[in-house]
């Protein structure tokens, strides 16, 4: 077991986008027995890196209030890509 903490992170899509990659989904489980969406990569010049709070390995629980549970990977990707200019992420950090 491990401790987790949740945080709301508000990002503004910048010139190089949100600037992170995701893995996971019901059809692409990245963590055993967990179909959640996880951050796999953060681009050094993207909005997420400049904000500084999002970390590789974080689990993203929701985007703009929309729950990411039980989503196909592609549907999760589309949700992020269509999330607009101001993007609110509810994330779970492992401590």
């Amino acid at each position: 077991d491990y401790l987790v903490t949740e945080e709301e992170i508000n990002l503004t899509r910048g010139p190089s986008g949100l600037g992170f990659n995701i893995v996971g989904g019901t059809d692409q489980q990245y963590v055993s027995n967990d179909s959640g969406i996880y951050v796999s990569e953060i681009d050094e010049n993207g909005a997420a890196a400049l904000d500084g709070r999002l970390q590789e390995g974080d689990k993203i629980l929701s985007v703009n209030g929309q729950d990411l549970k039980n989503l196909l990977h592609q549907d999760a990707v589309d949700l992020f890509r269509n999330a607009g200019y101001a993007v609110s992420l509810r994330v779970q950090h492992r401590l």
Epitope: G17, V23, H73
Partner: nanobody, 128 residues
Framework: DVQLVESGGGLVQAGGSLRLSCAAS????????MGWFHQAPGKEREFVAE????????GYADSVKGRFTISRDNAKNTVYLQMNSLKPEDTAVYYC?????????????????????WGQGTQVTVSE
């Protein structure tokens, strides 16, 4: 980590076709977004095309839309770039690249900095 090996380059006349292949080693190939970039002499490496892990998301540079097609075979750990209606300005070294996961941004934002793993490149020369 992933090792990438490109093949299929060569010399072709303008208007001709080539199919590039990129074989990847390592497991969980379907978790990687795969891309192709090209680099002409004296120029920076430029995005050509990319494909998501399940093949659902594809993106292309404006200069190759309608001429190039990217595809992948996850059972063979291979990504392909079918290049049709080739032009002399397509002459370059073509590189295969990989990054774990799917970018949350469309390919309009893509640059070589977004990819972590690279092949050694294969030369494509298009003559007049």
């Amino acid at each position: 980590d992933v090792q990438l090996v490109e093949s299929g380059g060569g010399l072709v006349q303008a208007g001709g076709s080539l199919r590039l292949s990129c074989a990847a080693s390592g497991r969980t190939f379907s978790s990687y977004t795969m891309g192709w970039f090209h680099q002409a002499p004296g120029k920076e490496r430029e995005f050509v095309a990319e494909i998501g892990g399940t093949g659902g998301n594809t993106g292309y540079a404006d200069s190759v839309k309608g001429r190039f097609t990217i595809s992948r075979d996850n059972a063979k750990n291979t990504v392909y770039l079918q290049m049709n209606s080739l032009k002399p300005e397509d002459t370059a070294v073509y590189y295969c690249a990989a990054v774990i996961g799917s970018p949350t941004d469309s390919s309009d934002y893509r640059s070589s900095l977004d990819y972590d793993y690279w092949g050694q490149g294969t030369q494509v020369t298009v003559s007049e």
